[in-house]
Interface confidence: medium
């Protein structure tokens, strides 16, 4: 009679994580009598996967019920596959004895596990940066297999080209990770912009995963200042305004100085938002010119988002206005908030 052969028809099997893997094995003869065992790997360190004679293998079931005489199908199904299950599986025929002795092995079936990449996580720089500066964004995704993966960067739908990507580890592994760094040049219009990292993998069936970062968390747009003198409201009063334009984020503190002395400090509250996401704010100072004998240097000083202060000054020509007798005060007014400075 022809000698028994152990046939594993599939050289390789690929299964998505979480699914079941069926590993096929048949034998060609009933002789010699003895059990079949399944192993992962070969050699002395091989791992026993299934042996009904002894042991407990809750994830393994037999494909054939093998409750017929002369059964020759020893295929198994392994449930809830994870990347850790990847490897080469051998169906091995033993000859019955005390103990059973290995008689013949199948050629092996390589099980590869298709693991989905995790949702990409995009992170930006720790500190804010201003327009015209280049900032780096990183994108990370883990746990995918096989190794082949595609990563793209977009800014507002436009694909970026300045990035570097690494997939680790370089050698064989049960699962892989990807790390990519993209460089993005900021513009003043980027408050509403988004940077997107897009990952495509065979397990995603053409529906890539995306991670996003809002540039509003990265950008700082410094304000432009303009100090103007409004027409005289009353005979001895001049309204001076400081227009703070196009700044982001909103955190801003404004100080008025008269000839270098602090007159008033306030925090931006009722700002107006521009279409591009930046803010405008206006502060005004009502100056009683009759309180001054000499010209007054008015300075609008702005500290934005913890950065060094920027300022803009305006010279108020006192000589151009008649002085009011008996008055020695300059009154400032912003809205309903009035204070007298002596």
């Amino acid at each position: 009679e022809e000698e028994l052969q152990v046939i594993q028809p599939d050289k390789s099997v690929s299964v998505a994580a979480g699914e079941s893997a069926i590993l096929h094995c048949t034998v060609t003869s009933l002789i010699p009598v003895g059990p079949i065992q399944w192993f992962r790997g070969a050699g002395p360190a091989r791992e026993l996967i299934y042996n009904q004679k002894e042991g407990h293998f809750p994830r393994v079931t037999t494909v054939s019920e093998s409750t017929k005489r002369e059964n020759m199908d020893f295929s198994i199904s392994i449930s809830n596959i994870t990347p850790a299950d990847a490897g080469t599986y051998y169906c091995v025929k033993f000859r019955k004895g005390s103990p059973d002795t290995e008689f013949k092995s199948g050629a092996g079936t390589e099980l590869s596990v298709r693991g989905k990449p995790s949702a990409p996580v995009v992170s930006g720089p720790a500190a804010r940066a201003t327009p015209q500066h280049t900032v780096s964004f990183t994108c990370e995704s883990h746990g995918f297999s096989p190794r082949d993966i595609t990563l793209k960067w977009f800014k507002n739908g436009n694909e970026l080209s300045d990035f570097q990507t690494n997939v680790d580890p370089v050698g064989e592994s049960v699962s892989y990770s990807i790390h990519s760094t993209a460089k993005v040049v900021l513009t003043r219009e980027d408050v509403h912009s988004q940077v997107i990292c897009e990952v495509a993998h065979v397990t995603l069936q053409g529906d890539p995963l995306r991670g996003t970062a809002n540039l509003s968390e990265t950008i700082r747009v410094p304000p432009t200042l303009e100090v103007t003198q409004q027409p005289v409201r009353a005979e001895n009063q001049v309204n001076v305004t400081c227009q703070v334009r196009k700044f982001y984020p909103q955190r801003l503190q404004l100080t008025w100085l008269e000839n270098g002395n602090v007159s008033r400090t306030e925090t931006a509250s009722t700002v107006t938002e521009n279409k591009d996401g930046t803010y405008n704010w206006m502060s005004w100072l009502l100056v009683n010119v009759s309180a001054h004998r000499d010209d007054v240097k008015l300075t609008c000083q702005v500290e934005h988002d913890g950065q060094p202060a920027v300022s803009k000054s305006h010279d108020l020509k006192v000589s151009a206005h008649p002085k009011e007798q008996g008055s020695n005060t300059a009154a400032e007014n912003t809205g309903s908030n009035e204070r007298n400075i002596y």
Partner: antibody, heavy 124, light 110 residues
Framework: QVQLKESGPGLVQPSETLSLTCTVS????????LSWVRQPSGKGPEWMGR???????AYNSALKSRLSISRDTSKNQVFLKMNSLQTDDTGTYYC??????????????????WGPGTMVTVSS | QFTLTQPKSVSGALRSTITIPCERS????????VSWYQRHLGRPPINVIY?????PSEVSDRFSGSIDSSSNSASLTITNLQMDDEADYFC?????????FGGGTKLTVL
């Protein structure tokens, strides 16, 4: 838990037909095979036949000509019919749940659960 | 088709060790697996050994099975004999499509 229970007449006339029922609970007849085993008084047990999980049957060749095994999976019952009974068919009749050890070319059958048995006497 | 032969009876003292043989009449004892069953009077049999030497988890480790090719026999060994071990014991194997039982052995604990 797994339970098997045989039922049928305790007394059968010679040359008549024996009908036994095995009612099971705790497992599915679609997943396990069942055998009938009898033990004549003062002798060792004798395997009579098997109802496979998929509905096929196998019989002891010495009894095949007068034995029939069937089932009703909806009622969880397996039936034995044996005709032309003689006095030497007297004994205890058991239904047993079969286990086979996967990975042997002749799956090693052993009987992991037995019913309590029913005594059948063939006498006029 | 082979037969399996067991002694009609075996006896042993309490806490002693006994062995019940089961001899195969033709063919090699190693050509098929052997199981053993215990039957107390008035109770259904229970499987105590399967696949020559495997013990179901619920069975005491005082029970063990083996095969001996020189005598073409399987054996059931019970150590530290207890009164409750007094019962009938029978072996079982198979030939092609037929399951074959031994005639049974009555174990008496003295």
């Amino acid at each position: 838990q797994v339970q098997l229970k045989e039922s049928g007449p305790g007394l059968v006339q010679p040359s008549e037909t024996l009908s036994l029922t095995c009612t099971v609970s705790g497992f599915s007849l679609a997943s396990y095979s069942l055998s009938w085993v009898r033990q004549p008084s003062g002798k060792g047990p004798e395997w009579m036949g098997r109802m496979y999980y998929d509905g096929d049957t196998a019989y002891n060749s010495a009894l095949k000509s007068r034995l029939s095994i069937s089932r009703d999976t909806s009622k969880n019952q397996v039936f034995l019919k044996m005709n032309s009974l003689q006095t030497d068919d007297t004994g205890t009749y058991y239904c047993t749940r079969d286990r086979s050890m996967f990975g042997t070319d002749y799956p090693h059958w052993y009987f992991d659960f037995w019913g309590p048995g029913t005594m059948v006497t063939v006498s006029s | 088709q082979f037969t399996l032969t067991q002694p009609k009876s075996v006896s042993g003292a309490l806490r002693s060790t006994i062995t019940i043989p089961c001899e195969r009449s033709s063919g090699d004892i190693g050509d098929s697996y052997v199981s053993w069953y215990q039957r107390h009077l008035g109770r259904p049999p229970i499987n105590v050994i399967y696949a020559d030497d495997q013990r179901p988890s619920e069975v005491s480790d005082r029970f063990s099975g083996s095969i001996d090719s020189s005598s073409n026999s399987a054996s059931l060994t019970i150590t530290n004999l207890q009164m409750d071990d007094e019962a009938d014991y029978f072996c079982q194997s198979y030939d092609s499509k037929i399951d074959i039982f031994g005639g049974g052995t009555k174990l008496t604990v003295l």
